[in-house]
């Protein structure tokens, strides 16, 4: 008789997960000479142990500690890019702008991104077939509490500048409930980030709108500037333009763009 | 074969200054990180510095940190180890050694020896 | 006062297997690759184990390392009296942003 087996409405573990996460962490490790002494079977166990054999629904911060013991990796504090709801332009800008990070871009964004996982209470199996799902479910499930966990530290080491990525096409260019607004914005640190730049992307080829005097924008700036840190906001009115731009910076065409 | 040979050792005062040099061959220089390792008399062996490949970055012991600098020029496929203000705890032979792909130290030179004294 | 703890000194008949310890932490051995070194007095030290378990070519089988969790270990088996020298285990530490050795382990043959 097959044993019971919780269903959940978001999907399974990624399958592949486990070597998918080890070849992740063997491949980072190659492209950043400076992580070569990275023992990446180490890593994957620390990952492991994070969820396995615990409830998918009872994960917290403190199961990932092991795992955030690898997150010392040394990225330029004054070169973070945070993105909300955008994450392909934000990924393209730091592949051609390479001293600027993104969370992805960093060991443990990098092994987690796109993938989803879980296991199961007090079984030592990965759940292949369904996992809970953050609105139907539960939040403190482990790719929720994973994010949240790497999110917050690495706001939290942001220093000087610190560039955001917004998405101008959506109804709430800034979103109180995205994790740039639940976890990135509040654990900035005022003692050590001086301005949050936002960048909002535009979508439509002929909108020529100020989209910094947003309204969600603006609640942007008053939770910034309540938390003694200086905002300003630019318009990207066309990324591509934009992306060509920072691939070729001395175009004679590039100079109004950033 | 790998050969890695140090110089500019010697006998300095304490405050004073000396640069150690490491002639490197038999490997491409420019794609490896390189670093200096230094075994103190009747001592183990310390870490002192490194610097990647590329568009050099450079690491160093606290013991270190702030007093010496690494360089490297790979058109002379040549280390350095530029040493100020020199203590009697830096006396040591300082090894070159280059670094494999996994950070371990694949080959070692046989070292120069530093006398810090008065 | 080393990051890593060796035991100052082991020892064996030849023949014999030996096996010297090194404990660390997550910061150094717990996430990164542990090697060791064999270092015999007025010769340049020489690597005999790398990525944990891995031996480079030359090395012979009888040099063995293992990893688990924050510590590793060496065995030397079929002890020779060429092998007595200093070994010393060595790993990149992150709160320290570089390498770290242990205090070294002198092995006697008997």
């Known amino acids: 008789v097959p044993r019971w087996r919780q269903q959940w409405s978001g999907p399974g573990t990624t399958k592949r997960f486990p070597e998918t996460v080890l070849a992740r962490c063997v491949k980072y490790t190659e492209i950043h000479p400076e992580m070569r002494h990275v023992d990446c079977q180490s890593v994957w166990d620390a990952f492991k142990g994070a969820f396995i054999s615990k409830h998918p629904c009872n994960i917290t911060e403190e199961d990932y500690q092991p795992l955030m013991k690898l997150g010392t990796q040394t990225v330029p504090c004054n070169k973070i890019l945070l993105w909300s709801r955008i994450k392909d332009l934000a990924h393209q800008f730091t592949q051609v702008q390479r001293d600027m990070f993104t969370l992805e871009d960093t060991l443990l964004g990098y092994l987690a991104d796109d993938l989803t996982w879980c296991g199961e209470f007090n079984t030592s199996k990965i759940n292949y077939q369904s996992c809970p799902d953050w609105r139907k479910d539960c939040s403190n499930n482990p790719v929720s509490v994973f994010w949240k966990t790497v999110s917050r530290r690495f706001a939290e080491a942001a220093c000087d500048v610190v560039h955001v990525m917004l998405n101008g096409s959506r109804s709430k260019i800034f979103d109180k409930n995205s994790t740039f607004g639940s976890v990135e914005v509040h654990n900035l640190q005022p003692e050590k980030v001086q301005t949050l730049e936002a960048w909002v992307i535009h979508g439509g080829r002929e909108d020529s709108r100020d989209l910094c005097q947003d309204p969600t924008i603006k609640e942007l700036e008053s939770i910034i500037s309540k938390r003694n840190i200086q905002f300003s906001c630019k318009n990207i009115y066309r990324p591509d333009k934009f992306l060509q731009c920072v691939k070729n910076p001395e175009d004679s065409s590039c100079t109004s763009e950033i | 074969q790998v050969q890695l040979v140090e110089s500019g050792g010697g006998l300095v005062k304490p405050g004073g200054s000396l640069r150690l040099s490491c002639a490197a061959s038999?490997?491409?220089?420019?794609?490896?990180?390189m670093s200096w390792i230094r075994q103190a008399p009747g001592k183990g062996l310390e870490w002192v510095a490194s610097?990647?490949?590329?568009?050099?970055?450079?690491y160093y012991a606290d013991s270190v940190r702030g007093r010496f600098t690494i360089s490297r020029d790979n058109a002379k496929n040549s280390l350095y180890l530029q040493m100020n203000s020199l203590r009697a705890e830096d006396t040591a032979v300082y090894y070159c050694?280059?670094?494999?792909?996994?950070?371990?130290?694949?080959?070692w030179g046989q070292g120069t020896l530093v006398t810090v004294s008065s | 006062q080393s990051v890593l703890t060796q035991p100052p000194s082991a020892s064996g008949t030849s023949g014999q297997r030996v096996t010297i310890s090194c404990s660390g932490s997550?910061?150094?051995?717990?996430?990164?690759?542990v090697y060791w070194y064999q270092h015999l007095p007025g010769t340049a030290p020489k690597l005999l184990i790398y990525?944990?378990?891995q031996r480079p070519s030359g090395v012979p089988d009888r040099f063995s390392g293992s990893k688990s969790g924050n510590s590793a270990s060496l065995a030397i088996s079929g002890l020779r009296s060429e092998d007595e020298a200093d070994y010393y285990c060595?790993?990149?530490?992150?709160?320290?942003?570089?390498?770290?050795f242990g205090s070294g382990t002198k092995v006697t043959v008997l």
């Open positions: 050694a280059r670094e494999g792909w996994s950070g371990e130290f694949t080959d």
């Open positions: 038999g490997f491409t220089f420019s794609d490896d990180y």
């Open positions: 610097v990647s490949s590329g568009r050099p970055t450079t």
């Open positions: 997550s910061s150094n051995i717990g996430f990164h690759f």
């Open positions: 990525k944990n378990n």
């Open positions: 060595a790993a990149w530490d992150d709160s320290l942003s570089g390498y770290v």
